[in-house]
């Protein structure tokens, strides 16, 4: 009686269950009764992920200079390549298929997260006692001066983009 | 129905070549592999090696790999045999098979 | 290589007798995905091999159930229940398991 259902690692065909390739293996010819499924590994800069039935392997990606991107971590029969971007650059999407450059952080906003190859910069506005006078992708908003811990007084009030200027307290005559 | 069409016979001379021919009809071609038998007079049956025609990937037996050279022709359903340098120990009955089903065989004679 | 080796060289039966045809091979020939690939022919003379027996005990479509494989490992047995005429000849072990893929040097069956 021929199946009709197959065990794990195995694939349906002619009435047979036959053998899956194992990953980093593409199928060179399905099993008959007399001979078992023939598989090939995958070739230089080839791969292929899982137990498999494919008659061709999937090419490494690449990792275009190009488009700001480099090497993470370079491909194996098993597993693709996987890319990242050149420092200052960020992917833009979860493939990495490209970069952009990392978003600064207008003044006024600081950075709340810098970012990371495979993220960009997140940044906040700053709060009321806080302040960033410069466009950057890794200042934070600092905090305004405290005039008083320097003996000073508050000459000219902060703001989300400028600090506090400070002066010397007005002397009793 | 399945058959493997082999010539009757074939008379070589020595340090010569001879490729045989087996032509299959009845299934499709690409889904067996094609395996060559040798079989001198009044002998045993001796495995020369396998081709399978979708993927021309072969397997040859050690002692025929420098005298045997296996091939496909998918387009007209025939697999090759080559055989070269033949002397006399080559004189004998070659057979293509898909194992389940056997050509007649082609009848090698080698002798000047 | 993986030797097979058949017992007995010749088997004289009376027509209507059991018969049984031992195969050893030299090495277990379960593959390495749990296959056991041991076929039986029989080639009768001037004829080409017919297959039998596949894996071991599965029978060939159209042979007669008087026709039985049996065995694992290295020890194997073709056993034909009631010998009939047309059964007479050559009966080959073969394995497929292990390259280079061997046969048996053969048995031959013929009348008491």
């Known amino acids: 009686e021929p199946p009709t259902a197959c065990r794990e690692k195995q694939y349906l065909i002619n009435s047979q269950c036959c053998s899956l390739c194992q990953p980093g293996q593409k199928l060179v010819s399905d099993c008959t009764e007399f001979t078992e499924t023939e598989c090939l590994p995958c070739g230089e800069s080839e791969f292929l992920d899982t137990w498999n039935r494919e008659t061709h392997c999937h090419q490494h990606k690449y990792c275009d200079p190009n488009l700001g991107l480099r090497v993470q971590q370079k491909g194996t029969s098993e597993t693709d390549t996987i890319c990242t971007c050149e420092e200052g650059w960020h992917c833009t999407s979860e493939a990495c298929e490209s970069c952009v450059l990392h978003r600064s952080c207008s003044p006024g906003f600081g950075v709340k997260q810098i970012a990371t190859g495979v993220s960009d910069t997140i940044c906040e506005p700053c709060p009321v006692g806080f302040f960033s006078n410069v466009s950057s992708a890794f200042e934070k908003c600092h905090p305004w001066t405290s005039c008083e811990t320097k003996d000073l007084v508050v000459q000219q009030a902060g703001t989300n983009k400028t600090d506090v200027v400070c002066g010397p307290q007005d002397r009793l005559r | 129905q399945v058959q493997l069409q082999q010539p009757g016979a074939d008379l070589v001379k020595p340090g010569a070549s001879v490729k045989m021919s087996c032509k299959a009809s009845?299934?499709?071609?690409?889904?067996?592999?094609i395996t060559w038998v040798k079989q001198r007079p009044g002998q045993g049956l001796e495995w020369i090696g396998d081709?399978?025609?979708?993927?021309?990937?072969?397997k040859y037996n050690e002692k025929f790999k420098s005298k045997a050279t296996l091939t496909v022709d998918t387009s007209s359903s025939t697999a090759y045999m080559q055989l070269t340098r033949l002397s006399s120990e080559d004189s004998a009955v070659y057979y293509c098979?898909?194992?389940?089903?056997w050509g007649q065989g082609t009848t090698l004679t080698v002798s000047s | 290589d993986v030797l097979m080796t058949q017992s007995p060289l010749s088997l004289p039966v009376s027509l209507g007798d059991q018969a049984s045809i031992s195969c050893r091979s030299s090495?277990?020939?379960?593959?390495?995905?749990?296959?056991?690939?041991l076929e039986w022919y029989l080639q009768k003379p001037g004829e080409s091999p017919k297959l039998l027996i596949y894996k071991v005990t599965n029978r060939f479509s159209g042979v007669p159930d008087r026709f039985s494989g049996s065995g694992s490992g290295t020890d194997f047995t073709l056993k034909i229940s009631r010998v009939e005429a047309e059964d007479l000849g050559v009966y080959y072990c073969?394995?497929?398991?292990?390259?280079?893929?061997?046969f048996g040097g053969g048995t031959k069956l013929e009348i008491k």
């Open positions: 009845g299934y499709i071609l690409t889904t067996y592999w």
């Open positions: 098979a898909r194992r389940d089903y």
């Open positions: 090495q277990n020939i379960v593959n390495s995905q749990g296959n056991t690939y």
């Open positions: 081709i399978h025609p979708g993927s021309g990937s072969t």
């Open positions: 073969f394995q497929a398991s292990l390259v280079p893929w061997t």
